[in-house]
Structure formats: structure tokens, C-alpha cells
């Protein structure tokens, strides 16, 4: 349905409030260093222009594409070259190359200060003084730090953020009310950002087919009662939504997501029995709820898969007629029967099936050739099962912090060239799989754990891509999306690594560590642990554990001392000397 004015169309569909919020998110995700006030000014100018187009779709420039309008606006920023360097060269290009250029300059790890949470009273005053600016600032700060954050979902987070302040700033104990809510939003926001980053990486690095395969598997697990045709329609629509959001087309994305939620709710009888509650909610909550909805019950008496996909004489005929449709059906049928498998495992099975058919359908006796294809699945299924069992046992034995430390050592030895902050961040997140998934019964552990690990390893991949330092990381990240986790799991100690020069400054600590939160203190210790492994990759687990215990004793002692700074200086030297002598640093 072609519209004379795309900007007018989206303004009318979304409404002024959502339009302005989405344009702000789009601009902040592109120009991550620009001050808040500059973005607000640009958004207001775009909004005023959109209103003129709503009034008269034939008005000047109203027929231009959104990329042209937004790109032209971004290119008016005076300090573009001095702030962004070569990104300014994008402005010399024409659409669609200009937008592609902006997309390529999105920075997953922008050099921005950490967001420090002000005192509750200060936040409540700011909220009451100017609610609109306060909420816009939230969108801006999240969007510029998370340039791939799923924009319509960020609107949902902003709605919850507003609700938290509305409720808690009137409460008797504001802090007790507000802080847990803000913590929850922060943690959920980081998780949401990372999940969306994987979707965008799938689309951008591995293409639409890879994303569609992922979506078929996930939606078939979630909606096992839905027909294949229904799942295929949902996959097509969902792919369009995410392609748009990952491509910076946030207005179209939000509009299409709303349409998809509407369609799902209008057709829930043929999709899932679990959607009723979601579909009674307002739009933003509804879309979020659908995205998180639990798996529906599997239909009773599903026939064996072997009949259609192994025993049938028509396997090669059906495959040859429409390869992707047939593989899609295989994936749908397998996934709806296996909510206990991770999506990536299901995709590995589908890939194995595809490879077998490619080989066997060209053979003299195809049926004889592919008859045992399901036997090839067994080791693929057992590998993640065994890994999860071992790691959950280790997690239960060690607890989260020490489990993270075990992973820090493991991953630093695998890829010691990776920067210490990245190793700490990624290993800490890998370690959270324990608390997140090990509590689940067997049937839910693998989808929880392996699909979560895919999200975390994608963080490693996107951070490493910005500054590549390890061929092994590049190889695991680029060869196969679904085999990233097995690829990293299979890496052994990097024997080619030349240990890092010892630098006493790395192991110098100050009294400020005593006032840090427990989390920040853990990060300091884990940073030291990574550096220790980089200096001494051959150190045993026991030696590293003992040195870390010495470090804990040193911090504990000095934080109790009267003259903390002197204690850190003197005892720190002793600690470094003792560790050097014992480990031969």
C-alpha cells in the first residue's frame, strides 16, 4: 500500500508521542556521541516537518523516503567530522548507501561514561519538574549505549520506567520502592539488548535465511499446535519487523510489530492457547507479552517424524521440488516435538539433515543412503546435554562468583589476546547461566542454557569484531552461527600465546576498592585474575585459586586498617612480590 508521504503515514499510524520517541531512538543509535539537547532539537524539527506532511501530503519534500529525510537531518550536525571522524564521509553518499554507511559505524562499545544513578530525591525532583524531558533522556541514554536495542521494546521499558517513578516518588520510602524496580529494568534491559543484538547479527552476518530458520524453530516450539503455513506466515512477518529494526527503520518496524501483534491476537485460536492474557493488554505490553509467552502444550499423538522424512520414498522428490520449504517443514516438525532442545541444536540437526539429503539424493540408492540419518543426531544431542550437566554440577559446587572465575580462567587460556574488560564482561555473563538455568528441570535446561550462551557469545563476537585480535575468535564467530558455542567449547589452551610482560601497575590497588559495591569489587578481583592468567597461562587452577585467596585476604586486611592507603601500598608490594616469586611471573 503505497503512500504519497511515508513520513505522514508513519506519523498517523504511530501517533505523535511514539513517533517522536522512535525518531529520538533512531538518531541516538546513529549519532551516539551527540549531546541530548542536539538530538531533541533534530527530533522537534523532524516532527514539525511530519505535521506539515500530515496536513498536506503533497507539500514539498513530503514524498521523500524516511532514510532520505532522516539522513539529511543527521548530516546537518555541525560537528559531525570532529566528533565522528570518517562517519562524516557517509554524508557524501546517496541513499541507500548513506544509510548503510551509518549502520556500519554503529559502535557496540561506545566510549561513553558509565551511567551513575543519582540520589532518589534528585531523580524524583527531576521527574516532577519535567517528566517529558526526564523520559526522553532515558530513551536517549539507553539508545546511544545500545545502538541495536529493539526500539518498540524500548518504548515498553520507558513506559515501565515512567510507572516506577509515578508510583515510587509518592511512596513513604521512595528508595525502597524505586531502587529494586530500577535494578530490574536495568538487568532486563541489558538482557533485551543482548538478545536483539544476536538477531541483528544473524540477519546482517548470516542473512535472512539464517534468521528465518531460527524463527521457524523458535516459533514452532512456542506454537506447536499451529499449522506449518501459519508458522511460516508469522516467520515472514517477524523477519520483516527485525530486518527493519536492525536496519534503522524504526518507524516501519514499530508499525509492523503492532500489526503482527494484532494479527496474532485476531488469530490466536489457530496459533496458541497461551495468548489470551497477552491479547487483553495495551499495545506495548501486548507485544512484549507475546514475545515472552510460554510454549503451548504439544498436540497429543503426533506421528513419528521418520515416516515423512526418512521412510517415505518421496523424500528426495519433495526435497528437490522446494528445498527450503521441505527443510522448513522438517525443522517445524522437529521443533514442535522438542521444546526440550535448544534452538541452535534444532538448527544443527536441520543442517545435518540437509547435508545428508544433498549427498544422498545424488547417490545410486538415496533411501539406503539416508536411512540412518537420525542416528547421526544422537551425538549432536548428547554433546550439549553432557556439557550442561557438567557445568551445572560445577556451578552448584562453586556458586556464581567462583563459577564465573572458573570460566574466566578457561576463556582467558583459550583466547588470551582478547582485552581484559571483554573477557571479564563475557565470562561474568557466561557464568550467569548457572543461576539462570541450572535451577530448571532437565526438560528446560538446554533451551535455557544453550540459547542464552548464544546470546553471550555473540557479545564476544561483536566486541571482538570492532578490534580483532584473535584468529580463533574470528573463526568461531564467522564460520557458523549455530556452531559458535561448540566451536568455543572445543578450543584448548592457546599454546602459541606469548605471556604478557609483567606490569606491577596492573596489580596495584587503592583504598577506593573498600567503598565499592560487592559487584564492583568482584569485577576488580576478576580483572586481576584475567591479568594473572595472561602473565602466567601455565599456572594451575590451584595456584590461581590460592593467589586469588591471597588477594582477597589482602583487600580484607587493608579495608579494616586504620590507614588504608598505606596498607594497600605496603601490603600490595608484598603480595605482588610473593605472587611473582611463587609463580615466577
Amino acid at each position: 500500500d503505497a503512500h504519497k508521504s511515508e513520513v505522514a503515514h508513519r506519523f498517523k499510524d504511530l501517533g505523535e508521542e511514539n513517533f517522536k520517541a522512535l525518531v529520538l531512538i533512531a538518531f541516538a543509535q546513529y549519532l551516539q556521541q551527540c549531546p541530548f539537547e542536539d538530538h531533541v532539537k533534530l527530533v522537534n524539527e523532524v516532527t514539525e516537518f511530519a505535521k506539515t506532511c500530515v496536513a498536506d501530503e503533497s507539500a514539498e519534500n513530503c514524498d521523500k523516503s524516511l532514510h532520505t529525510l532522516f539522513g539529511d537531518k543527521l548530516c546537518t550536525v555541525a560537528t559531525l567530522r570532529e566528533t565522528y571522524g570518517e562517519m562524516a564521509d557517509c554524508c557524501a553518499k546517496q541513499e541507500p548507501e548513506r544509510n548503510e554507511c551509518f549502520l556500519q559505524h554503529k559502535d557496540d562499545n561506545p566510549n561513553l561514561p558509565r551511567l551513575v544513578r543519582p540520589e532518589v530525591d534528585v531523580m524524583c525532583t527531576a521527574f516532577h519538574d519535567n517528566e517529558e524531558t526526564f523520559l526522553k533522556k532515558y530513551l536517549y541514554e539507553i539508545a546511544r549505549r545500545h545502538p541495536y536495542f529493539y526500539a518498540p521494546e524500548l518504548l515498553f521499558f520507558a513506559k515501565r520506567y515512567k510507572a516506577a517513578f509515578t508510583e515510587c516518588c509518592q511512596a513513604a520510602d521512595k528508595a525502597a520502592c524505586l531502587l529494586p524496580k530500577l535494578d530490574e529494568l536495568r538487568d532486563e534491559g541489558k538482557a533485551s539488548s543482548a538478545k536483539q543484538r544476536l538477531k541483528c547479527a544473524s540477519l546482517q552476518k548470516f542473512g535472512e535465511r539464517a534468521f528465518k530458520a531460527w524463527a521457524v524453530a523458535r516459533l514452532s516450539q512456542r506454537f506447536p499446535k499451529a499449522e506449518f503455513a501459519e508458522v511460516s506466515k508469522l516467520v515472514t512477518d517477524l523477519t520483516k519487523v527485525h530486518t527493519e529494526c536492525c536496519h534503522g527503520d524504526l518507524l516501519e518496524c514499530a508499525d509492523d510489530r503492532a500489526d503482527l501483534a494484532k494479527y496474532i491476537c485476531e488469530n490466536q485460536d489457530s496459533i496458541s492457547s497461551k495468548l489470551k492474557e497477552c491479547c487483553e493488554k495495551p499495545l506495548l505490553e501486548k507485544s512484549h507479552c507475546i514475545a515472552e509467552v510460554e510454549n503451548d502444550e504439544m498436540p497429543a499423538d503426533l506421528p513419528s517424524l521418520a515416516a515423512d522424512f526418512v521412510e517415505s520414498k518421496d523424500v528426495c522428490k519433495n526435497y528437490a521440488e522446494a528445498k527450503d520449504v521441505f527443510l522448513g517443514m522438517f525443522l517445524y516438525e522437529y521443533a514442535r516435538r522438542h521444546p526440550d532442545y535448544s534452538v541452535v541444536l534444532l538448527l544443527r540437526l536441520a543442517k545435518t539433515y540437509e547435508t545428508t539429503l544433498e549427498k544422498c539424493c545424488a547417490a545410486a540408492d538415496p533411501h539406503e543412503c539416508y536411512a540412518k540419518v537420525f542416528d547421526e543426531f544422537k551425538p549432536l544431542v548428547e554433546e550439549p546435554q553432557n556439557l550442561i550437566k557438567q557445568n551445572c554440577e560445577l556451578f552448584e559446587q562453586l556458586g556464581e562468583y567462583k563459577f564465573q572465575n572458573a570460566l574466566l580462567v578457561r576463556y582467558t587460556k583459550k583466547v588470551p589476546q582478547v582485552s581484559t574488560p571483554t573477557l571479564v564482561e563475557v565470562s561474568r555473563n557466561l557464568g550467569k547461566v548457572g543461576s539462570k538455568c541450572c535451577k530448571h528441570p532437565e526438560a528446560k535446561r538446554m533451551p535455557c542454557a544453550e540459547d542464552y550462551l548464544s546470546v553471550v557469545l555473540n557479545q564476544l563476537c561483536v566486541l571482538h569484531e570492532k578490534t580483532p585480535v584473535s584468529d580463533r575468535v574470528t573463526k568461531c564467530c564467522t564460520e557458523s552461527l549455530v556452531n559458535r558455542r561448540p566451536c568455543f567449547s572445543a578450543l584448548e589452551v592457546d599454546e602459541t600465546y606469548v605471556p604478557k610482560e609483567f606490569n606491577a601497575e596492573t596489580f596495584t590497588f587503592h583504598a577506593d576498592i573498600c567503598t565499592l559495591s560487592e559487584k564492583e569489587r568482584q569485577i576488580k578481583k576478576q580483572t586481576a585474575l584475567v591479568e594473572l592468567v595472561k602473565h602466567k597461562p601455565k599456572a594451575t587452577k590451584e595456584q590461581l585459586k590460592a593467589v586469588m585467596d591471597d588477594f582477597a585476604a589482602f583487600v580484607e586486611k587493608c579495608c579494616k586498617a586504620d590507614d588504608k592507603e598505606t596498607c594497600f601500598a605496603e601490603e600490595g608490594k608484598k603480595l605482588v612480590a610473593a605472587s611473582q616469586a611463587a609463580l615466577g611471573l
Epitope: 590460592a546 591471597d550 585476604a553 586486611k557 612480590a577 610473593a578 611463587a582
Partner: nanobody
Framework: QLQLVESGGGLVQAGDSLRLSCAAS????????MGWFRQAPGKELEFVAR????????YYADSVKGRFTASRDNAKSTVYLQMNSLKPEDTAVYYC?????????????????WGQGTQVTVSS
């Protein structure tokens, strides 16, 4: 499991010296820090000294600093506490303990395996 056996306690005059030993058998000795604690009659268990896994790093309670020296010999799976310039207030049962996997380094709760203790009495 780890067995720890202290020896070397006794009755001495104020100003004298004693050397306590703690011999370990069982679980790996050299992987963990060792601690010395003491308990005077009617008092709480009190931290005295910690010697790290390699024997190169020691921490002491303020009350014994400069007078006591903790050391270890990993080849012999033994930890020592050399006590000089003893005072009557040093009278207590002395225990050696092996560090656990968590908890404070200066608190009994952070130590997993314990000896049976050896009595030290300092008369004035």
C-alpha cells in the same frame, strides 16, 4: 579429608619462646593458606596468623605482630608458629586450620579443617 595435628605447646615463663608445629596429612596441603587461631579460657576463638600457600605472605593479628612468625614447609606438609617474647595474655589453646573455599581469611568460619589444639600456658 585432611588431618591436622598440632604439637609444641607447653608451660613457659613470660619472655620465653615456643615453636608450635602442625603436621598435615590427607588433602593437598600446598594449595591452601593455613591459619593459626587461639582460644583463651572463657573467650572467643581469635585469629592469630595466616600464612599463604607458598609461605611467602603472612598476616598477623595486631596483638602478636613483631613477636610471632608463621611459616610453612610444603615438602613436609607442616606449618609452624614461632612465638617469641611470650606474655601471660598469650595463654590459650592454639589451633591450626586449613583455609576453606570461601568466607573471611581472618575468621574461623573461613577455615575448613582444624587440628585438635595444643595448650600454651605463659606464667608470670
Amino acid at each position: 579429608q585432611l588431618q591436622l595435628v598440632e604439637s609444641g605447646g607447653g608451660l613457659v615463663q613470660a619472655g620465653d619462646s615456643l615453636r608450635l608445629s602442625c603436621a598435615a596429612s590427607g588433602r593437598t596441603f600446598s594449595d591452601y593458606a593455613m591459619g593459626w587461631f587461639r582460644q583463651a579460657p572463657g573467650k572467643e576463638l581469635e585469629f592469630v596468623a595466616r600464612v599463604n600457600w607458598s609461605g611467602l605472605l603472612t598476616y598477623y593479628a595486631d596483638s602478636v605482630k613483631g613477636r610471632f612468625t608463621a611459616s610453612r614447609d610444603n615438602a613436609k606438609s607442616t606449618v609452624y608458629l614461632q612465638m617469641n617474647s611470650l606474655k601471660p595474655e598469650d595463654t590459650a589453646v592454639y589451633y591450626c586450620a586449613q583455609r576453606g573455599d570461601s568466607g573471611s581469611n581472618f575468621d574461623p568460619s573461613g577455615y575448613r579443617y582444624w587440628g585438635q589444639g595444643t595448650q600454651v600456658t605463659v606464667s608470670s
